[in-house]
């Protein structure tokens, strides 16, 4: 799979492959994988990909299921790249405060916050 | 500040305090703090709170600016709690795949993905 494929297209294809291979993936009935309790997904990327690793090690490889796990590893690579971009640019306090305001505003409106 | 205050109310109050104390916070013109390049905020919580720590250490404390940083530390505490909930519950593969599908679906529709 060329890494040049746009990430958005990669995600769409991965969703389709996930549906296709569901039966094969759930074959191991004893396997248990951590599942986040909330829906603030971006906070849990590390655990999600650890779970994917566990699942991959327990799944018979071959055919397009390999493509599914290859896609997922490319998505992880993209997310790792995004995480790197969190701390690379040292800016002035002014810009940091604008970003902090945006972050808190998003928390206020979009995060799933329990009372 | 009682930690019993709902997180949503805490975030709102913090946004207001941020506006109030902006002039004081930007007083240090040489200070530089990492600012994420993208808007996938949840991926960057660690760096954001490191930045807040840097800012706090460089800001003259007293009055309601102390309340601002206290609030921000309570918000961090809430987020740390959410992060803990990412990996506490070991579930069957079926549930994990449901969550993975939801995660990819959210990535597909809500994440800020560069082409």
């Amino acid at each position: 799979i060329p890494t040049e494929i746009p990430t958005s297209a990669l995600v769409k294809e991965t969703l389709a492959l996930l549906s296709t291979h569901r039966t094969l993936l759930i074959a191991n009935e004893t396997l248990r994988i951590p599942v986040p309790v909330h829906k603030n997904h971006q906070l849990c990327t590390e655990e999600i990909f650890q779970g994917i690793g566990t699942l991959e090690s327990q799944t018979v490889q071959g055919g397009t299921v390999e493509r599914l796990f290859k896609n997922l590893s490319l998505i992880k690579k993209y997310i790792d790249g995004q995480k790197k971009k969190c701390g690379e640019e040292a800016r002035r306090v002014n810009q940091f405060l604008d970003y902090l305001q945006e972050f808190l505003g998003v928390m206020n409106t979009e995060w799933i916050i329990e009372s | 500040i009682p930690t019993e205050i709902p997180t949503s109310a805490l975030v709102k109050e913090t946004l207001a305090l941020l506006s109030t104390h902006r002039t004081l916070l930007i007083a240090n013109e040489t200070l530089r703090i990492p600012v994420p390049v993208h808007k996938n905020h949840q991926l960057c919580t660690e760096e954001i709170f490191q930045g807040i720590g840097t800012l706090e250490s460089q800001t003259v404390q007293g009055g309601t600016v102390e309340r601002l940083f206290k609030n921000l530390s309570l918000i961090k505490k809430y987020i740390d709690g959410q992060k803990k909930k990412c990996g506490e519950e070991a579930r069957r593969v079926n549930q994990f795949l449901d969550y993975l599908q939801e995660f990819l679906g959210v990535m597909n529709t809500e994440w800020i993905i560069e082409s």
């Epitope: 800016r91 002014n94 810009q95 305001q101 945006e102 998003v106 | 390049v37 993208h38 808007k39 800020i112």
Partner: antibody, heavy 119, light 107 residues
Framework: QVQLVQSGAEVKKPGASVKVSCKAS????????INWVRQAPGQGLEWIGY????????RYNQKFKGRATLTVDKSTSTAYMELSSLRSEDTAVYYC????????????WGQGTLVTVSS | DIQMTQSPSSLSASVGDRVTITCKAS??????LSWIQQKPGKAPKTLIH???RLIDGVPSRFSGSGSGQDFTLTISSLQPEDFATYYC?????????FGQGTKVEIK
């Protein structure tokens, strides 16, 4: 492809207001800040301010604070720059420009809108 | 506000010449500087960002260098389409400020 298309030229009287639009296409509008820059005839470039369509937050060059108002309409992916109390020195080409990331370089520019202030 | 001083304000050069334009910031702006090209009657176009990073699609004859307060734009071999006005822009702090421009004319 990514594009910013601005409204047409305007002629205004001193004291009036003008509202220039900038329609974005080819990308998710809320992901990038929109900056406004102006250029008086034969002069250099001057930054007016930016707006963050993600949260409607705007920041202005002090020189324009109180006279310039930046707004967005997310439903149409359009940014607006309104300048009030116009004077002859406001005669300029006004450009919108997209920020590549948060507080980054301007990677896409609009074609410009000429605003002429004359009695 | 941060002042950006560009020099020269204009220069005459021939096709094939190596051209250098400098920009000096009134205070440290790290590397948050871009170089912008503008042709008469056209919208500006960003060529370089972060002082030395060439934007996709911009010819490699353009290069940028510098950090802190002193920056340089170099055109290694001037082409006919490069005759234009060039501006530096600091996006380190608000308000963002531009240099006054350097007009590159045909000798």
């Amino acid at each position: 492809q990514v594009q910013l298309v601005q409204s047409g030229a305007e002629v205004k009287k001193p004291g009036a207001s003008v509202k220039v639009s900038c329609k974005a296409s080819g990308y998710t509008f809320t992901n990038h800040h929109i900056n406004w820059v102006r250029q008086a005839p034969g002069q250099g470039l001057e930054w007016i301010g930016y707006i963050n369509p993600y949260n409607d937050y705007s920041r202005y060059n002090q020189k324009f604070k109180g006279r310039a108002t930046l707004t967005v309409d997310k439903s149409t992916s359009t940014a607006y720059m309104e300048l009030s109390s116009l004077r002859s020195e406001d005669t300029a080409v006004y450009y919108c420009a997209r920020d590549y990331g948060n507080f980054w370089y301007f990677d896409v520019w609009g074609q410009g809108t000429l605003v002429t202030v004359s009695s | 506000d941060i002042q950006m001083t560009q020099s020269p304000s204009s220069l005459s050069a021939s096709v094939g010449d190596r051209v250098t334009i400098t920009c000096k910031a009134s205070q440290d702006i790290n590397s948050y500087l871009s170089w912008i090209q503008q042709k008469p009657g056209k919208a500006p176009k960003t060529l370089i960002h972060r002082a030395d990073r060439l934007i996709d699609g911009v010819p490699s004859r353009f290069s940028g260098s510098g950090s802190g307060q002193d920056f340089t734009l170099t055109i290694s071999s001037l082409q006919p389409e490069d005759f234009a006005t060039y501006y530096c822009l600091q996006y380190d702090d608000f308000p963002y400020t531009f240099g006054q421009g350097t007009k590159v004319e045909i000798k």
